[in-house]
Interface confidence: low
């Protein structure tokens, strides 16, 4: 209504402070200057605005920055970030890791939203590759982040970034993703000694070829069954009974419990019964 468009006398906001929570939506629209809001964005998060009031503040910023917000504003969006659409975020140019961290903090504990996915995409594309600091940050907030990337996107991850990856970050990776990550991990950890190397490479072994598994079997690594079960079937099939026994060490007894599951099932069927009998586990080829 026409009479609501003008700011009532004495209500013009001189700064962003708690008094604004008592303003109706139309009063916020009429009495808060967008440029003032932009320069004092860091104060917004300390004020318990309703979601409706935040909508008004977002609208004011949208009008002030139709081509997309500057990073100085983005860094201080706080909870207002939750109001942004992927379309809004696609207009942004986020270059600072601190800005990324600030916005991820707002979404902390939540699953990755389309807004966050768009933000990360914009940030990574702007950097040109997924560097170690970025990967460190992203996997800290979203342990499943790495596995949400396509094999093509993963190919841009430099080997140096692999040091940031924790075992749980690979929980949901499929074999195609591990095929890309494993060679990078092998390169990243190549200067480590045997036992340390195995600890680091273990999570990536779902992408390992047969020859690497054969090499590991000569190093007394004692691979656990959970890791063995994630190996590529085509990589496991050529292994001999002796090689699997050396690879698993004391964990070899676990083969019995997994004899009906891949890759154990398929591997058993490839072996001579005489060789299987040497394990003493009652495995039937």
């Amino acid at each position: 209504e026409v009479e609501k468009t003008a700011c009532p006398s004495g209500k013009k906001a001189r700064e962003i402070d708690e008094s604004l929570i008592f303003y109706k939506k139309w009063e916020l629209e009429a009495c808060v200057d967008a440029a003032l809001l932009a320069t004092q964005m860091d104060r917004v998060n300390a004020i318990p605005f309703t979601y409706e009031q935040l909508d008004v503040l977002k609208h004011k910023l949208d009008e002030l920055y139709p081509q997309g917000y500057p990073e100085s504003v983005i860094q201080h969006l706080g909870y207002l970030f939750l109001k942004m659409s992927p379309e809004d975020i696609r207009k942004w140019n986020v270059t600072s890791l601190e800005t990324l961290k600030a916005l991820l903090e707002v979404n902390k504990g939540h699953e990755m939203s389309p807004q966050v996915a768009t933000l990360i995409d914009r940030f990574v594309k702007g950097r040109g590759q997924l560097d170690k600091d970025t990967l460190d940050t992203l996997t800290a907030f979203y342990p499943g982040y790495l596995c949400s990337l396509s094999p093509e996107e993963l190919s841009s991850v430099p080997p140096s970034s692999i040091w940031a990856v924790r075992p749980q970050d690979l929980d949901t990776c499929d074999p195609r993703q591990l095929d890309v990550l494993y060679p990078k991990a092998r390169l990243a950890f190549q200067n480590m000694n045997g036992s340390e190397y195995f600890v680091k490479i273990q999570s990536f072994l779902g992408g390992a070829p047969t020859e690497d598994l054969k090499a590991l079997s000569q190093q007394n690594v004692s691979m656990d069954l959970a890791t063995f079960m994630k190996l590529r079937t085509d990589a496991v099939l050529p292994l001999t009974v002796a090689e699997v026994q050396k690879l698993l060490g004391p964990h070899v007894e676990g083969l019995k419990a997994e004899e009906r599951h891949r890759p154990v099932r398929d591997w058993i069927l490839r072996q001579r019964q005489d060789d299987l009998d040497t394990l003493g586990l009652g495995l039937q080829g």
Epitope: H110, E111, S113, T172
Partner: antibody, heavy 119, light 107 residues
């Protein structure tokens, strides 16, 4: 056929502890995130806790944080819920459920086990 | 936390009726919504995930729609075995939260 079988429920005094188990069969257990959901008598469903495939990531509802611990043993195809410092308001049927097509949605549920906290 | 509000809390209907249950979230959740059916003394069963995707083995008379904050579960040709309580659940963010339930009773 996927089957989830809960056990370990029963009557316990306030402040006491219980450990629930959920034995899974008919699925590659180590490939799925799992969760516990509870239902107080005559009430609706309430999510309690969730765990990633390796057990490396866990989530809890505020009402149980610090008192309940979710864990899993992939070699035994079993999910656990250790419940300490139990309160009357924890009285409920506890269901374990398997992650569905998306993390957070659940396509298979166990039949539930009743936990009663009373003096 | 995201609040999920279902309506109505109960309804009476006859076999063959078209039944609609709505679920509203306190903030936008995209399409991250599931629907479950629960019969007395039984565990819940998954009907719909991702707001509109039918769970394998669920009859096609069940359908889901919506995104953002407003969602609907529709049963197009109510059958005797459909009399039960229905719950929506958001999985956009932790903690995961359920609606209060809608009990569908025989008229």
């Amino acid at each position: 056929e996927v089957q989830l079988l809960e056990s370990g429920g029963g009557l316990v005094q306030p402040g006491g502890s219980l450990r629930l188990s959920c034995a899974a069969s008919g699925l590659t257990f180590r490939s799925y995130a799992m969760t516990w959901v509870r239902q107080a008598p005559g009430k609706g469903l309430e999510w309690v806790s969730g765990i990633s495939v390796s057990g490396g990531i866990t989530y809890y509802a505020d009402a149980v944080k610090g008192r309940f611990t979710i864990s899993r043993d992939n070699s035994k195809n079993t999910l656990y819920l250790q419940m300490n410092s139990l309160r009357a308001e924890d009285t409920a049927v506890y269901y374990c459920a398997k992650r569905g097509a998306a993390v957070g949605s659940f396509d298979y549920w166990g039949q539930g086990t009743l936990v009663t906290v009373s003096s | 936390d995201i609040q999920m509000t279902q309506s109505p809390s109960s309804l009476s209907a006859s076999v063959g009726d078209r039944v609609t249950i709505t679920c509203r979230s306190s903030q936008g959740i995209g399409s991250w919504l599931a629907w479950y059916q629960q019969k007395p003394e039984k565990a819940p069963q998954s009907l719909i995930y991702a707001a509109s995707s039918l769970q394998s083995g669920v009859p096609s008379r069940f359908s889901g729609s919506g995104s953002g904050t407003d969602f609907t579960l529709t049963i197009s040709n109510l059958q005797p075995e459909d009399f039960a309580t229905y719950y929506c659940q958001q999985y956009n963010s932790y903690p995961l939260t359920f609606g209060g339930g809608t009990k569908v009773e025989i008229k």
